[in-house]
């Protein structure tokens, strides 16, 4: 079972001092960001017992394996169900604590009831404050049963549940009709999935015989030991004030485990710590009683004395739970309660025994779960003990379970059961992930999901060039870190596979699926320089560059031109996709802007060194368009244009440009300059008769401005073919600018 304990501090005089702590003894518990261990969760479960909303509870993490809930402001905050969730994957386990109000109308005689499938469970609610109304029993918040208040027996209301089955498990409550739910008695019923002493899918396996109030888990056959006891069968008591599967945890505070309720994974439930009893776990055991809730009786023999935490303390010469075994009887010594091996390994198992007469090699045997008996291959005889060594045949999964070491002499016999866990070495289910690549290295994340058992002790990354028959290169890495594969060949595909290992001999799993990772191509090394540039308009720039001459083919796929507009903090990138190109036209630039310009060679995704930068100032944009352009035919070869000056001019106009085009014609338009910017009319001469023309114009300051609207007009009559249009502004002749 998962080593998870939920502690409730029951010193209830002040709810603000109340706290719940969840402690995990699991390796890697609570490391939230760690892929190998989800965090511990501790929360109030309001699904069944709803209490009035209060200020949020405070959760504090103390290291990786402990979490504490505080911030209870009033007694009603405490009433209800709390749960702690810990363990990873299939071992994820929920531990539940049910808190009753000490001032409730009804109080449970016993909160947690663990029963076997088919048993009769009896829940008993003791009357604390009588009401003369019905008592309503509920199961998981839903109506279950009604009792008349007259039906109380010795001041208790009993709910009998015959032939219980696992679905009957849950939270039960007894409440007076119409009383506050906070005045209810709350119970937890845990129904094991098997009958007494059995476990496994078909309940065919026999429980190990848990001692000291331990409860046999119906899924894995392990004993869930009460707080303060340890060992495969809970046979060993912890030192006072200690708990956890290996007695590794210590009760907080000076009074040890007094006033603490301990909740453990099902099917154990909750109890006081060893040596304590009572609804608030503040009463010491009466003489002759010991253990959790003081449920155990000592019955010590041969002069043994009863310790309320550990049971019988035997005088020298005697051992056993009740000091009933003479030290002359052989005794198995220091047998580990749990051993772990990897699948298909052939481990050696040692079993030591002492006694009078002295055990010899043939008197110690090892029994597997299937009943097979192994005899020791050798024995080491020392003055105080004999250690038999057993060579175990290749392990299979069915070997998981309880093994037994047995010693027999004429003085008697002893046996010790221990749990063997056969673990499956982990096998990656996915290929590793490529994080970044360069021409000679790959950065890989080896963390992948896996089948089999953890924890992961090492990760091996195997790699070699794709389609190669050469040996694989191997790198051993930490499970939680990314790996850099170095000294690789550029532009080469590598097959990369992960192999995971768990602790112990034979813990290496099979290799995971391969993935193809390709190194980048070589970095371009040549540095271009800018030959020159010239402005082709307010928003256009032609740039040319050169490369140094080097022998051999050019390493590059093209060029990247970068324009940096420092005023606006904007960068413009232009990709020139031919490595032979030495010139480029940049369009759509911002007029009047100061740019810093550079060029660099690129190859695949890699950039070479940038050229020394150049600084370029684009001319500002031209003025707005002239307004109200109007055309009127004067003769068969002349059309007069009139307009109004543009509004909001940034400076004095240097000239106007008129564009003339035959309507529907396919030829290029003609541009005619009007060099007298103060004019607002001009005559275009030399036009063809009876021809429809299109006109538009724009002004120029430092650069050409926006075009005006386009106007249409036809020349008059059927005159001679003219040589081509010319322009006259008032009486002055103007040249033609095409």
């Amino acid at each position: 079972a998962v080593d998870l304990t939920l502690l409730a501090n029951l010193r209830l005089t002040d709810p603000q001092r109340f706290f719940l702590t969840c402690v995990s003894g699991e390796a890697g518990a609570g490391r939230g960001s760690d892929a190998w261990g989800p965090p511990l969760l501790l929360e109030k479960d309001d699904r069944i017992v709803r209490t009035p909303p209060g200020p949020p509870l405070r959760l504090a993490r103390n290291g990786s394996h402990q979490v504490t809930l505080r911030g209870f402001s009033k007694p009603s905050d405490l009433v209800g169900v709390f749960s702690c969730v810990g363990g990873a994957g299939a071992r994820r386990t929920r531990v539940i604590y049910v808190h009753n109000s000490p001032g409730a109308h009804l109080l449970p005689d016993k909160v947690t009831h663990t029963v076997n499938k088919g048993d009769t469970a009896v829940l008993s609610a003791r009357v604390h404050k009588e009401k003369q109304t019905d008592v309503i029993w509920k199961s998981n918040g839903s109506y279950f049963y009604t009792l008349d208040w007259h039906e109380a027996q010795d001041g208790r209301f009993l709910l009998q549940l015959p032939n219980v089955q696992p679905p009957s498990s849950g939270i039960y409550s007894a409440t007076y009709l119409e009383a506050s739910p906070l005045g209810s008695a709350f119970f937890r019923l845990i129904v094991r999935g098997c009958g007494a002493g059995r476990w496994g899918p078909g309940c065919t396996k026999e429980c190990p015989g848990c001692l000291h109030g331990g409860v046999c888990h119906d899924h894995d056959g392990e004993c869930v030991c009460p707080p303060g006891f340890t060992g495969t069968r809970c046979e060993q008591a912890c030192r006072e004030g200690r708990f956890g599967q290996s007695c590794q945890e210590q009760c907080p505070g000076i009074s040890g485990c007094r006033g603490l309720t301990f909740c453990l994974p099902d099917p154990y439930g909750c109890s006081c710590g060893s040596g304590w009893r009572g609804s608030q776990c503040q009463e010491a055991c009466a003489p002759g009683h010991f253990g959790a809730d003081c449920r155990l009786q000592c019955q010590c023999q041969n002069g043994g004395t009863c310790d309320r935490f550990s049971g019988c303390v035997c005088p020298s010469g005697w051992h056993g739970v009740h000091c009933e075994k003479s030290d002359r009887i052989p005794q198995i010594l220091n047998m580990a309660s749990e051993l772990e091996f990897n699948l298909e390994t052939m481990p050696r198992i040692n079993c030591a025994a002492a006694g009078n007469p002295f055990p010899v090699r043939g008197s110690i045997e090892l029994r597997k779960p299937d009943g097979t008996v192994l005899l020791s291959t050798k024995a080491i005889v020392e003055p105080e003990k004999t250690t038999a060594e057993f060579e175990v045949p290749r392990l299979v999964l069915a070997d998981s379970g309880f093994w037994e070491c047995r010693v027999s002499t004429s003085g008697g016999q002893d046996s010790r059961r221990f749990k063997v866990n056969v673990k499956v070495p982990p096998v990656p289910l996915a290929a590793p992930r490529l994080l970044t690549k360069q021409s000679r290295q790959l950065v890989v994340s080896p963390l992948v999901s896996f089948s089999g058992d953890g924890p992961i002790s090492t990760v091996r990354l195997h790699y070699r060039p794709q389609d190669s028959t050469m040996d694989w290169s191997t790198i051993v890495v930490d499970p939680s870190e990314n790996v850099t594969l170095m000294n690789l060949r550029p532009k080469t595909g590598y097959s990369v596979r992960v192999q995971l290992s768990r602790p112990g001999e034979g813990g290496e799993g099979a290799w995971g699926p391969p993935t193809l990772m390709t190194t980048d191509c070589p970095e371009p090394l040549l540095q271009p320089w800018l030959e020159g540039w010239h402005v082709e308009g307010t928003d256009r720039l032609r740039v040319s560059w050169s490369l140094p001459l080097v022998p051999g083919p050019l390493v590059g796929d093209g060029f990247l031109l970068r324009l940096w507009d420092g005023t606006r903090g904007q960068e413009r990138r232009e990709n020139v996709s031919s490595p032979q190109a030495r010139t480029a036209l940049l369009t759509g630039l911002t007029p009047g802007t100061h740019y810093q310009l550079d060029v660099q060679l690129y190859h695949c995704t890699l950039l070479g060194p940038a050229s020394p930068p150049a600084h370029v100032l684009l001319p500002p944009s031209g003025p707005p368009a002239p307004r109200h352009l109007h055309a009127q035919a004067l003769s068969d070869s002349e059309i007069q244009l009139t307009w109004k000056h543009p509004e909001a001019l940034p400076g004095p106009i240097s000239k106007y440009v008129v564009e003339v085009q035959v309507a529907g014609g396919a030829g290029d338009p003609l541009w005619i300059d009007v060099d007298r910017p103060e004019e607002t009319s001009t005559i275009i001469r030399g036009l063809n008769a009876s021809t429809r023309y299109l006109f538009r114009m724009r002004a120029s300051i430092q650069g050409l401005g926006d075009w005006s609207n386009t106007v249409e007009e036809s020349t008059l009559g059927n005159g001679l073919q003219a040589e081509g249009p010319v322009q006259e502004s008032r009486a002055a002749e103007e040249g033609l600018d095409q």
Epitope: T133, D134, Y143, Y145, T146, L147, E151, L177
Partner: antibody, heavy 117, light 111 residues
């Protein structure tokens, strides 16, 4: 689906006896408190009696105390009302009802009892 | 013993809303009550339980048009978007030591 089906009603002379039955289905009968409620023609509802799940405790309205007996057979999922010394004022439709936390949450369709000479 | 008072009749138009009242006798203003509907020639049907704080728990299959509320010693049943099948007798009911108590009922007519 919860169903309650009353039977056993009919015409009876004053002073006579009648036994009503209520067959329950669709729920765990043995866990619920059960009741009888009656309704005289054109009148409102009047509670008659109830019985606890175990059958060990019963209550009656003053108007029927000593004359009527409520009982149940949990193995047959059936509720009964034994009515003795019937009077004209006992004429009514008798409904059986399942109680949940103080109130009837399911009712039967009723059976008519007529006490007349 | 608690007494429950209901007005004998109420009426409202099809599609409109109606609010029925049940008054608890003095000293019983903290009691919860239940509402039951009885359509003509049928057995009663449980609608909902209404607590003194106005919270209510409806029976299985009761439409959202039915809601309960509370003010002092008064308990209310509100039916919105009235339909012709809502024409029925409505009884309030409470419980005490050893008995159930019903109100006299309100006959609701849908116009």
């Amino acid at each position: 689906e919860v169903q309650l089906l009353e039977s056993g009603g009919g015409l009876v002379q004053p002073g006579g006896s009648l036994r009503l039955s209520c067959a329950a289905s669709g729920f765990t009968f043995s866990r619920y408190k059960m009741s009888w409620v009656r309704q005289a023609p054109g009148k409102g509802l009047e509670w008659v009696s109830y019985i606890y799940p175990s059958g060990g405790h019963t209550e009656y309205a003053d108007s029927v105390k000593g004359r009527f007996t409520i009982s149940r057979d949990n193995s047959k999922n059936t509720l009964y009302l034994q009515m003795n010394s019937l009077r004209a004022e006992d004429t009514a439709v008798y409904y059986c009802a399942r109680e949940r936390e103080g109130t009837p949450d399911y009712w039967g369709q009723g059976t008519l009892v007529t006490v007349s000479s | 013993q608690s007494a429950l008072t209901q007005s004998p009749s109420a009426s409202a138009s099809l599609g409109a809303s109606v609010k029925l009242t049940c008054s608890l006798s003095s000293g019983h203003s903290s009691y919860a009550i239940a509402w039951h509907q009885q359509q003509p020639e049928k057995g009663p049907q449980y609608l909902m339980k209404v607590n003194s704080d106005g919270s209510h728990t409806k029976g299985d299959g009761i439409p959202d048009r039915f809601s309960g509320s509370s003010s002092g010693a008064e308990r209310y049943l509100t039916i919105s978007s009235l339909q012709s099948e809502d024409e029925a007798d409505y009884y309030c009911q409470t419980w005490g030591t050893g008995s159930w108590v019903f109100g006299g009922g309100t006959k609701l007519t849908v116009l």
